[in-house]
């Protein structure tokens, strides 16, 4: 009834609740003198199916029949129309329309540790549109039953409240779940547990790490459980790993010793526990323990590599390089390298730590066999010395690889290829290519780069420290015994033409021709490797053709004589850059008239 | 000062049913779990049944599907509703109340977790 209804009634048969498909009538009759004042004849009882009119009668009480009704609330609303009013409520009434509930399903049931309560979930299957009442029951050893009921709408969750305790954790439990509401009721099957198979430990907590001797050899880690528990899961990995390492452990009592660390390495620890063997589930898992390993003394060996230069008569500049040992060789922290350079036959030796840096440089005799060792020490101990002998890298001409090439290769990489040297090709031991940013002055402090490869390579693909518009100076060493030669060749990643032309500083007179002296382009604005200069000259106020005269890029060029100019005629010179991709823009113009006889 | 004062016990015949009620004053017991237990001369009570401060309801098997626990914590009251009564179910009924809500299943069927108790009331089923 949604009013008062002191006009009249609806009524409802067979029921308010019915089933889908089902068919209901709906009856409105007027109490007495409540139809229309004069003509109570003339009563028009509308029926209303929320606000569209279904059906009408003249007199005093209306029959329908109504079939066909969806899921869910239908309200019907009776009204009384007279002549020349508006239309008045009688009554009304809602009828719900669902289905019975079909049998739970997938019922079970958890107790959260062994402190915590027990809990089951269902499916509940379609839904009833209804008003469904959920009761759970839980029968168990001591001739007790648990039950509790569902007010929710959508019931699927129950929480007992009830915390199973081991006393006998053999012992049987049967839940079962019944919904019912107006048009029937259904129960799920019965499903049979012990304390075990419903109980899932907390997982593991205040885990902790211990390394004996402060050794990554002598490993145990540490946690609290439950009282129950019987088995444990370990997972570990290192920090940056997503593959995790697993181990199964039975009555660890809270400790597990780890063999398979490796030092210096941040590792994640977690740990998951389980009751019985075979019954019940795993906890989550733990928290996660961060931990650190121990150092251990430094593996393998160190990539040494040297550059000599000559600076007097009596003594020579010896650059000594090395890379970094992989994290998995250097095992700790790199403390300070060690180098230690000795003079093979008079026995003298010099032994210096180097902190901070790779390089180290050093001014030496030209007389005498040198030899270096390095190592890299850490707070454990020092790697193996690399030794190498302190040779002419390039001295043995017929040891020098051949057409040595260096093509770009996509971004920020260069191919360089070579074909073995005349002499004998399997003399050779390794072959050790070499690059480094073309700096005009021959710069010494520009940094190193190097990688080695086997006897029967031909090529490599240098990528470490290359950028794009930059010119590389590549040298290919070709390395037998305590002999070597080498082969160079400009190379680069990217180019295009360069940004500007070389600016002449000065031109000179000397016998009959002009020598034209220019700064070099600046590196940033070079686009690449140059392959020529080229220098201009027209005579002044002259509209022809300017000549020009090409000359090939040398490193340290940075002057060329002309002597086609006529005497006493006024020119004007300029210059321009070239790369593989093409010409700069003109540098400076300068005037200039040579004064010398005319022929 | 705690009390709970039951009523409603009397004679039915087999078959028949009766609402056993537990008033009860001193304190509040909406948080507590409460219980009905019963005795017959010679014997030890016996738990019928209980229902926790979460309103979960516990029954001895013995009553199961025949009896109704319920809780008005308003009028810190609760309820036992018996119907199909049984001769066996003739006793002396008693209302207990727990301290706290203890969620262990073991204390729940043992009278001596119960602190506080009523005077009790008769329940008697005749053929």
């Known amino acids: 009834k949604i009013d008062a209804c002191k006009r009249g009634d609806v009524t409802v048969k067979p029921s308010h609740v019915i089933l889908l498909g089902s068919t209901v009538n709906i009856t409105c009759s007027l109490k007495p003198r409540q139809g229309c004042f004069h003509y109570s004849r003339r009563n028009k009882l509308i029926l209303y199916k929320f606000d569209r009119r279904i059906n009408f009668h003249h007199g005093h009480s209306l029959n329908s029949q109504v079939t066909g009704l969806p899921l869910g609330t239908t309200l019907f609303v009776c009204k009384l129309a007279c002549i020349n009013s508006d239309e008045i409520q009688i009554c009304g009434a809602e009828i719900f329309v669902g289905v019975a509930p079909e049998q739970p399903q997938n019922l079970s049931c958890i107790q959260k540790g062994e402190q915590g309560t027990v809990a089951c979930t269902w499916e509940r299957g379609r839904d009833t549109h209804l008003y469904t009442e959920y009761t759970l029951q839980l029968s168990g050893p001591k001739n007790l039953t648990w039950q509790k009921q569902c007010k929710d709408i959508y019931c699927d969750y129950l929480d007992f409240g009830i915390n199973l305790t081991p006393e006998s954790p053999e012992s049987n439990f049967t839940a079962k779940v019944t919904a019912v509401n107006s048009l029937g009721s259904s129960s799920s099957l019965p499903s049979t547990f012990t304390f075990l198979d419903i109980v899932r430990p907390l997982p593991p907590w205040d885990i902790r790490i211990k390394f004996q001797k402060a050794s990554v050899s002598r490993c145990t880690l540490y946690w609290r459980d439950e009282g129950l528990v019987l088995l444990n899961r370990l997972r570990y990995r290192p920090s940056n790993s997503r593959l995790w390492n697993m181990v199964n452990v039975t009555k660890a009592k809270g400790r597990h010793d780890l063999l398979d660390l490796k030092p210096f390495t941040e590792y994640e620890f977690q740990i998951s526990s389980k009751l019985h063997l075979y019954k019940g589930s795993w906890s989550d898992w733990s928290e996660s323990l961060r931990a650190q390993t121990p150092e251990e003394e430094p593996t393998g060996m160190l990539d040494v590599w040297y550059m000599k230069r000559h600076i007097d008569y009596s003594r020579q500049q010896i650059s000594l390089f090395w890379k970094n040992l992989s994290v998995s060789e250097a095992r700790g922290k790199i403390l300070h390298y060690q180098v230690t350079l000795q003079e093979l036959t008079g026995g003298k030796a010099m032994t210096q730590n180097i902190t901070g840096h790779t390089s180290w440089t050093t001014v030496i005799p030209r007389t005498g066999n040198w030899a270096v060792a390095v190592s890299a020490a850490n707070s454990k101990g020092s790697s193996l010395p690399t030794r190498i002998n302190i040779m002419n890298l390039c001295e043995a001409g017929l040891l020098a690889p051949r057409q040595v090439s260096a093509n770009s290769e996509g971004m920020d990489n260069i191919l360089v290829t070579w074909q073995p040297p005349r002499k004998d090709p399997s003399a050779v031991q390794e072959y050790v290519v070499e690059w480094r940013e073309l700096h005009p002055g021959g710069d010494t402090q520009v940094p190193l780069n190097w990688l080695r490869s086997r006897p029967y390579n031909v090529s490599a693909l240098i990528s470490e420290n290359i950028k794009s518009y930059i010119c590389y100076e590549i040298r290919v060493y070709a390395l037998s015994g305590d002999q070597g030669g080498c082969s160079s060749i400009l190379g680069n990643s990217k180019h295009k033409a360069p940004l500007s032309g070389p600016h002449i500083n000065a031109i000179t007179e000397e016998k009959g021709s002009i020598l034209i002296s220019w700064n070099s382009i600046p590196v940033q604005e070079q686009m690449g490797c140059l392959l020529h200069y080229r220098i201009y000259w027209k005579e002044r106020d002259s509209n022809s053709q300017p000549q020009l005269c090409e000359i090939p890029y040398r490193v340290s060029q940075n002057s060329h004589p002309i002597n086609s100019l006529q005497p006493r005629v006024t020119y004007v010179l300029w210059m321009t850059a070239l790369t593989a991709a093409g010409e700069s823009s003109h540098g400076n113009e300068r005037e200039f008239c040579l004064q010398g006889k005319a022929n | 000062q705690v009390q709970l004062q039951e009523s409603g016990g009397g004679l039915v015949q087999a078959g028949g049913s009766l609402r056993l009620s537990c008033a009860a004053s001193?304190?509040?017991?909406?948080?507590?779990?409460m219980g009905w237990f019963r005795q017959t001369p010679g014997k030890e009570r016996e738990f019928v049944a209980a229902?926790?401060?979460?309103?979960?309801?516990v029954y001895a098997n013995s009553v199961k599907d025949r009896f109704t626990i319920s809780r008005d914590n308003a009028k810190n009251t609760f309820y036992l509703q018996m119907h199909s009564l049984k001769l066996e179910d003739t006793a002396v009924y008693y209302c207990?109340?727990?301290?706290?809500?203890?969620?262990?299943?073991?204390?729940?069927?043992?009278?001596?977790?119960?602190?506080?108790w009523g005077q009790g009331t008769q329940v008697t089923v005749s053929s």
């Open positions: 207990a109340g727990d301290r706290y809500g203890s969620s262990r299943d073991s204390v729940f069927s043992s009278p001596t977790n119960y602190p506080y």
């Open positions: 001193g304190r509040t017991f909406s948080k507590s779990t």
């Open positions: 229902i926790t401060w979460t309103d979960t309801e």
